[in-house]
Amino acid sequence: EEELQVIQPDKSVLVAAGETATLRCTATSLIPVGPIQWFRGAGPGRELIYNQKEGHFPRVTTVSDLTKRNNMDFSIRIGNITPADAGTYYCVKFRKGSPDDVEFKSGAGTELSVRAKPSAPVVSGPAARATPQHTVSFTCESHGFSPRDITLKWFKNGNELSDFQTNVDPVGESVSYSIHSTAKVVLTREDVHSQVICEVAHVTLQGDPLRGTANLSETIRVPPTLEVTQQPVRAENQVNVTCQVRKFYPQRLQLTWLENGNVSRTETASTVTENKDGTYNWMSWLLVNVSAHRDDVKLTCQVEHDGQPAVSKSHDLKVS
């Protein structure tokens, strides 16, 4: 009778992460008597995947009933595959021995490769806000994909960006990979409603590329422009002076009126009006009693926007 051979018909198997891998193995004879074991890798450092005789292998099920006397099918299924399961799997026949079973014959091995989708890209912007005309950096990260080939594109409001650097790690062979990209974006005053998008395409994606977004509203600070104007003299010698605070973002703003350098009133922007571009306008007014002043009055509108150093605009009120 011919000597037992261990047949692993599949040289290679490709499986999607999360799915089940079937590793096929048959023996050509029932003799010699002894169990089958499955290993990942060869040599002394090999990893036991399944032992027919003993042990607990929760992710492994056998295709056939190995308790049946005439069974020669030793194929297994490994559930919930991850990229870390990639490797070459060997079906090994042991001969019953005392005290230990003795390795008798090994199959040629089946190489298990795993394809895994990239995680949803995460885009993060700078820690501090920046003003228009400044260049800010955004990063995009996606992890856990295999194979290594991946494309990443950056967009601002649908327009593709070209100023970015991308790295896929690790450089050498690995079970899975990560991508990291940094894009430089020049801010404009109109960017409150703008979005930066990182788009990742990979062979495993059946839909459109995965997208991560960042809203420039979280990055931009548009400083206000100030205009102080004097309204016509009202009854009882009162003058109405207004301070127009225009085109600012975010809304966080505190205004202080100074009369000849002395604080007259402080208020916080509340009932603002929003412009089409997402910036805000606000107006504050001060009633000045002209009869209380003998000399000209210097009125100053001082604005502290979003914790930045105050900006101010003055108006000289003539007392005639």
Epitope: P147, T151, V203, L205, Q206
Partner: antibody
Framework: VQLVESGGRLGQPGTPLTLSCTVS????????MGWFRQAPGKGLEYIGI?????SPYYASWVNGRFTISKTSTTMDLKMNSLRSEDTATYFC?????????????WGPGTLVTVSS | DIQMTQSPSSLSASVGDRVTITCRAS??????LAWYQQKPGKAPKLLIY???FLYSGVPSRFSGSGSGTDFTLTISSLQPEDFATYYC???????????FGQGTKVEIK
């Protein structure tokens, strides 16, 4: 799992024609689908795909001549203005579950003949 | 666009012969290559995907190898039902486009 193309017929140059691919046994919202064609006695030619979410992508030569769209159970190929060189058998196919780099299920094809 | 050059364009062989068909890409496509078999009046059938993985139900006499730009389809022992035309197909992960080779017709000697 099955794909069946329909709509192939004799068409006149300059006229539009829409082909359909009806699927069964799986959901079009889970897979990328493609259109291909093969002129008599010639090789296979890629036309375009539609993603699981419904975005079409075309071969560079298409230049707006064809439009791919889909409903829940059918994928359509609209040929805007037939030319004689469009005479071919048109196939629809589904990409494999492991990735978009290969097509594992094909329809039997539908023949389009363009002639005046 | 990537060009796929298949060779030979046709070959004559006998049952039991070992047959090798090659496919060359004009630029690297890594392992994104599939092989199809097509018989007259029929749709293509997938044989090999990702350069070397045998599609389920395909006889083990078919095998694929290669990476980068050069790929091979081998039929270890030609059977009567294998007489057909074979196509390679690439997918380019940057352009996300597909290209076919011009086909290899395997005929009975």
């Amino acid at each position: 799992v099955q794909l069946v193309e329909s709509g192939g017929r004799l068409g006149q140059p300059g006229t539009p024609l829409t082909l359909s691919c009806t699927v069964s046994g799986f959901s079009l919202s889970s897979y990328v689908m493609g259109w291909f064609r093969q002129a008599p006695g010639k090789g296979l030619e890629y036309i375009g795909i539609i993603s699981s979410s419904g975005s079409p992508y075309y071969a560079s030569w298409v230049n707006g001549r064809f439009t791919i769209s889909k409903t829940s159970t059918t994928m359509d190929l609209k040929m805007n203005s037939l030319r004689s060189e469009d005479t071919a058998t048109y196939f629809c196919a589904r990409v494999g579950p492991l990735g978009v780099d290969y097509f594992n299920i094909w329809g039997p094809g539908t023949l389009v003949t363009v002639s005046s | 666009d990537i060009q796929m050059t298949q060779s030979p364009s046709s070959l004559s062989a006998s049952v039991g012969d070992r047959v090798t068909i090659t496919c060359r890409a004009s630029q690297s496509i890594n392992s994104y290559l599939a092989w199809y078999q097509q018989k007259p009046g029929k749709a293509p059938k997938l044989l090999i995907y990702s350069a070397s993985f045998l599609y389920s139900g395909v006889p083990s006499r078919f095998s694929g190898s290669g990476s980068g730009t050069d790929f091979t389809l081998t039929i270890s022992s030609l059977q009567p039902e294998d007489f057909a035309t074979y196509y390679c197909q690439s997918w380019h992960y940057i352009s996300r486009s597909y290209t076919f080779g011009q086909g290899t017709k395997v005929e009975i000697k």
